[in-house]
């Protein structure tokens, strides 16, 4: 009796089970009662990453430098090219189809996590005792200067954007 279901890595066509093409190969012709499925390797800059019955291989992703992209991992006949962003940029999506400039943390905010090729800068407000007076994609919140360790006193209190100002202690005459 003709099969109604096939084994893993097979497909049903014309009432018979044919072998799927292995990753990296495309279907040329279906199997028959006399011949196996005919498959051909994908060409240069093409790939198929699953057992398949595709008649065309997929084109490797192009990492367009005009969009800030560069190749992170070159594609093979079985894998797509993986793109990432140029230094200072990160992907706008998981698929990494374009890049945007890393965000800078404004004064009063410091870098909690430096951006990568796939994630943006994460900023955090500087807590009491810390400040950031620059807009930066790398600078963390800095601790206020400790006047006491310098035998100085606080002349002007610090904020989340400014350091404390230290001055000499008043001398008793």
């Amino acid at each position: 009796e003709p099969p109604t279901a096939c084994r893993e890595k097979q497909y049903l066509i014309n009432s018979q089970c044919c072998s799927l093409c292995q990753p990296g190969q495309k279907l040329v012709s279906d199997c028959t009662e006399f011949t196996e499925t005919e498959c051909l390797p994908c060409g240069e800059s093409e790939f198929l990453d699953t057992w398949n019955r595709e008649t065309h291989c997929h084109q490797h992703k192009y990492c367009d430098p005009n969009l800030g992209l560069r190749v992170q991992q070159k594609g093979t006949s079985e894998t797509d090219t993986i793109c990432t962003c140029e230094e200072g940029w990160h992907c706008t999506s998981e698929a990494c189809e374009s890049c945007v400039l890393h965000r800078s943390c404004s004064p009063g905010f410091g870098v909690k996590q430096i951006a990568t090729g796939v994630s943006d800068t994460i900023c955090e407000p500087c807590p009491v005792g810390f400040f950031s007076n620059v807009s930066s994609a790398f600078e963390k919140c800095h601790p206020w200067t400790s006047c006491e360790t310098k035998d100085l006193v606080v002349q002007q209190a610090g904020t989340n954007k400014t350091d404390v100002v230290c001055g000499p202690q008043d001398r008793l005459r």
């Epitope: 009796e1 012709s29 199997c31 028959t32 009662e33 006399f34 011949t35 196996e36 005919e38």
Partner: antibody
Amino acid sequence: EVQLVESGGGLVKPGGSLRLSCAASGFTFSNYGISWVRQAPGKGLEWVASISSGGDNTYYPDNVKGRFTISRDNAKNSLYLQMNSLRAEDTAVYYCARAGEKAMDYWGQGTLVTVSS
Amino acid sequence: EIVLTQSPATLSLSPGERATLSCRASQTINNNLHWYQQKPGQAPRLLIKYASQSISGIPARFSGSGSGTDFTLTISSLEPEDFAVYFCQQFSSWPLTFGGGTKVEIK
């Protein structure tokens, strides 16, 4: 017991025609593809034609395409090979062979076709 | 067309010896290859399917190996009835093709 018996061979002049038959028994004929394979005297094996189990698909090598026609009658458990425009190089023993898991798992004893003037 | 080249053309051995027959394909055919044995005046007989799968009723001394383009039929210890001609056949694509055969003869 699976059996394939060829008949219809003989002597024929170049340009002539011949029809070979293959009678099958011992298995469900309509479930199997069948092929014709030939062997010239003292030579190797050469595939000649194949037909799917239902008879809807036929396959030929280029050197016999347009001259040979394979057919079957599942009701009669019979396979045929109509050979036209025969040439001296078609001289051979012709075997019918069953296709089981894409292998020629059972063969007939063969029938000799001689093309000569 | 896939061309199958068998070597050697003739193999002269004595009973009890090991026979190693080669079949090389002109392009990769995965494991889509069968082996047949033919004795004089008889029809061919299927020995090995899918390059290495045994056939019911065929003695265990016959084994096949290989994948891609290079295939081997091994007869571990020749019996008198094994002296015959051996053919490989590919079923990877049309047209179906056979190798030219290897004759195993008594030395």
